[in-house]
């Protein structure tokens, strides 16, 4: 298809040829093309391309362009040729090639498809059935990421209230670039009656750590010492903790943000692998104090999406005064 756009027309360069589009994995869309026929011999060919909404303009010498995109909507790429990297140079007539999502009734597609990466060890996805689906629909979730050779089918389908879901192992690998990539997700039904739904989950977002585990509470003078086990798999610069202390007598509710802290005081069991410690000042030892802790990822490691871990199990120390 030619986009005969006055702004884009140039007399010198013919359009690219054989522009085609294909899908790899679940959501990797690839366009390829051939150089224009009859290009000027003194022209060092560059290709100008952008998506249908004039987004992501690119000028490059390669005769291919790819994008990772959930194929829930039609997506088009326009490509032209030119003789320099100059964005102000008008490229040839732009050629356009589009790819449409799989066919099906849009009302049958699942909705609210979202995934959470739990403790960098498994991913749990959930969705709601589409409006035009039968209650006995059997769903299948497929997933792919860079460390997999092929698309995998998720085996652990479950139901929680109105939501359906599936979880699969996804362990952070040591490769430093692992988290720069995404997981591609597709949900459809076994019978092929519903329109497939796609999602792309960046591995830098929607990370939910496991809750910490409180190991020990102790008093020293009027200070309360709290020791806990950190969730596995995270490096210390990527987490912080919220320690909540409730006092039964004063009915106060104190919240402290805590950096992962070494257990250096003699009150703590020292040098225990993967534990953190914190001293809560000014706590009354002769009253009942209940502590719980939760943890959150640092925005500089994982994009902020407001996901705290669940709270740890509570632990109490001190004695509850009899009300007289």
């Amino acid at each position: 298809d030619y986009k005969d756009d006055d702004e884009s027309r140039t007399e010198t360069q013919p359009p690219v040829t054989n522009l085609s589009v294909s899908v790899e994995n679940l959501c990797t869309v690839i366009w390829t093309w051939n150089p224009p026929e009859g290009a000027s011999s003194n022209c060092s060919l560059w290709y100008f391309s952008h998506f249908g909404d004039k987004q992501d303009k690119k000028i490059a010498p390669e005769t291919r362009r790819s994008i990772e995109v959930p194929l829930n909507e039609r997506i088009c790429l326009q490509v032209g040729s030119q003789c320099s990297t100059n964005e102000s140079e008008k490229p040839s007539i732009l050629v356009e090639k589009c790819i449409s999502p799989p066919e099906g009734d849009p009302e049958s597609a699942v909705t609210e498809l979202q995934c959470i990466w739990h403790n960098l060890s498994y991913m749990k996805c959930s969705w709601l059935p589409g409006r035009n689906t039968s209650p006995d629909t059997n769903y299948t979730l497929y997933y792919w990421h860079r460390s997999l050779e092929k698309i995998h089918q998720c085996e652990n389908i479950f139901r929680e209230g109105q939501y359906f879901g599936c979880s699969f192992d996804l362990t952070k690998v040591k490769d430093s670039s692992f988290e720069q990539h995404s997981v591609q997700i597709m949900v459809k039904d076994n019978a092929g009656k519903i329109k497939p739904s796609f999602n792309i989950v960046p591995l830098t977002s929607r990370v939910k750590p496991d809750p910490p585990h409180i190991k020990n509470l102790s008093f020293h003078n009027d200070d309360l010492y709290v020791q806990w086990e950190n969730p596995q798999n995270f490096i210390s610069r990527c987490l912080f903790y919220e320690v909540e202390v409730n006092n039964s007598q004063t009915e106060t509710h104190n919240v402290f943000y805590v950096q992962e802290a070494k257990c250096e005081n003699p009150e703590f069991e020292r040098n225990v692998e993967n534990t953190s410690c914190f001293m809560v000042p000014g706590v009354l030892p002769d009253t009942l104090n209940t502590v719980r802790i939760r943890v959150k990822t640092n925005k500089l490691c994982y994009e902020d999406d407001k996901l705290w871990s669940n709270w740890s199990q509570e632990m109490s120390i001190g004695k509850k005064r009899n009300s007289t």
Epitope: F240, Q259, K299
Partner: antibody
Framework: EVQLVQSGAEVKKPGESLKISCKGS????????IGWVRQMPGKGLEWMGV????????RYSPSFQGQVTISADKSISTAYLQWSSLKASDTAMYYC???????????WGQGTLVTVSS | EIVLTQSPGTLSLSPGERATLSCRAS???????LAWYQQKPGQAPRLLIY???SRATGIPDRFSGSGSGTDFTLTISRLEPEDFAVYYC?????FGQGTKVEIK
């Protein structure tokens, strides 16, 4: 007591290089981020970037990426901010500050005034 | 990129009055990451509030922070002479442009 002590004021010419420092004490230097904040004369605060001295992982604000380099030497508990070629527009007060993982700056250095003028 | 907009630009009040400073984010942010600072002329900024509502060490209880989502507030319940300064909100890589609290 947590302290961040910065190197003294600098007067430089455009095109010259510069490295200013920030020495931390009174806490575990490798367990907190160190950030750099610019304040141009009569203006507000600008977040430049941060470094985690424990593993030298750095993050820059897009506005400062490629313009400055942040580094740290954990053996002497010191962080650095450097320029390879100064411009007149780099004239400003530069603060270092300690940053816990929740992103606020809880302790600040006294500031280093950098003046770039021909 | 998130933009933090502070209002008003300048607040003219008398000692003993209540000051209410606003910080609005261009998109919803986690309150865990919202901080407030005070800066006096010729001095480094000082952290007042972190996590939107937790007072930093040594900060008097006349300073309080609240809010969630896109709207955050710093309140100074009774202005003392030493509170007249510029106040900034911050969320990781972004600072607001500042609110100057001056003596009326």
């Amino acid at each position: 007591e947590v302290q961040l002590v910065q190197s003294g004021a600098e007067v430089k010419k455009p095109g010259e290089s510069l490295k200013i420092s920030c020495k931390g004490s009174g806490y575990s230097f490798t367990s907190y981020w160190i950030g750099w904040v610019r304040q141009m004369p009569g203006k507000g605060l600008e977040w430049m970037g941060v470094i985690y001295p424990g593993d030298s992982y750095t993050r820059y604000s897009p506005s400062f990426q490629g313009q400055v380099t942040i580094s740290a030497d954990k053996s002497i508990s010191t962080a650095y901010l450097q320029w390879s070629s100064l411009k007149a527009s780099d004239t400003a007060m530069y603060y270092c500050a300690r940053m816990p993982n929740w992103g606020s700056f809880d302790y600040w250095g006294q500031g280093t005034l950098v003046t770039v003028s021909s | 990129e998130i933009v933090l907009t502070q209002s008003p630009g300048t607040l003219s009040l008398s000692p003993g009055e209540r000051a209410t400073l606003s910080c609005r984010a261009s998109q919803s942010i986690s309150s865990s990451y919202l901080a407030w600072y005070q800066q006096k002329p010729g001095q480094a900024p000082r952290l007042l509030i972190y996590g939107a509502s937790s007072r930093a060490t040594g900060i008097p209880d006349r300073f309080s922070g609240s809010g969630s989502g896109t709207d955050f507030t710093l309140t100074i319940s009774r202005l003392e002479p030493e509170d007249f300064a510029v106040y900034y909100c911050q969320q990781y890589e972004t600072f607001g442009q500042g609110t100057k609290v001056e003596i009326k």
